[in-house]
């Protein structure tokens, strides 16, 4: 994780900063949302547990043509140790519920903020 984050500052950043940057980006998305996010696209809901970052990326990467979440997708790829491509579901253990991207982002944000407040940066 020490190589994460080059979006806001050059060079390596600590894991706490990388997580903070991801939270900031998700906050910006939720606060700046005017029309339905990504035209109301639906994505697979995920379990917010171990492997969450890869699962989140695998779910969101299937949304194309949505500039609002492109930065989030790039950030999540920095947290996920393996390469993720569209249609790949190795980390999405349960694929039974689809939700709107906007709700997905809100749920992810709440969980990431809790991790940050707890000091769980890795």
């Amino acid at each position: 994780l020490t190589c994460l984050g080059g979006f806001a500052s050059p060079g390596p950043v600590p894991p706490s900063t990388a997580l903070r940057e991801l939270i900031e980006e998700l906050v910006n998305i939720t606060q700046n949302q005017k029309a339905p996010l990504c035209n109301g696209s639906m994505v697979w809901s995920i379990n917010l547990t171990a492997g969450m970052y890869c699962a989140a990326l695998e779910s969101l990467i299937n949304v194309s043509g949505c500039s609002a979440i492109e930065k989030t997708q790039r950030m999540l790829s920095g947290f996920c140790p393996h390469k993720v491509s569209a249609g790949q579901f190795s980390s999405l253990h349960v694929r039974d519920t689809k939700i709107e991207v906007a709700q997905f982002v809100k749920d992810l944000l709440l969980h990431l903020k809790k991790l940050f407040r707890e000091g769980q940066f890795n």
């Epitope: 500052s9 706490s16 939270i23 606060q31 903020k113 809790k114 940050f116 407040r117 000091g119």
Partner: antibody, heavy 123, light 107 residues
Amino acid sequence: EVTLRESGPGLVKPTQTLTLTCTLYGFSLSTSDMGVDWIRQPPGKGLEWLAHIWWDDVKRYNPALKSRLTISKDTSKNQVVLKLTSVDPVDTATYYCARTVSSGYIYYAMDYWGQGTLVTVSS
Amino acid sequence: DIQMTQSPSSLSASVGDRVTISCRASQDIRNYLNWYQQKPGKAPKLLIFYTSKLHSGVPSRFSGSGSGTDYTLTISSLQPEDIATYYCQQGNTLPLTFGGGTKVEIK
């Protein structure tokens, strides 16, 4: 109106445990995004952050004092309690509680403070 | 821990003067810098959070700026009621840490 009020013993003997209570008015610690911090200020000196507790019971401490500190909340009474064990004269200070909110970014900015309670550690 | 260094430790200025107080962090705090005002015998009050956002009820003569490790609090026109000690505080990384304070007096 948001207000916080600290209460404490005033005088504590060395080696004893200091118990401080912060009563919250105008907001509830059961509300999402709310947190309460404890900060202290020795006479004529600067501010030192001690601990905080969030609405969902996430607790964080200053590592320099972590082994001696315990923070807890009583939502029904809208109170936050801080305990500091094995006190020493260097713990003499005004102890403040303050509110923190994390609705957007997590700023860790304390937007409302209590008036403070002076605690003297002396035999 | 992140060390916060304020300068000057004290200053004296005339009513109407522009006053600036500096705060330097030992590492990048990414704009998570808050300013407090403490009057003698009173609790601190939040003036500015996240470098430049004015807390509700704070007069517009107070402003904040900076980035990275260097931050500034400015009082555009000093008033008698601004006599106080001002503290910066970083909110980027726990433990939260404060600067040593800057005491502002009227000439």
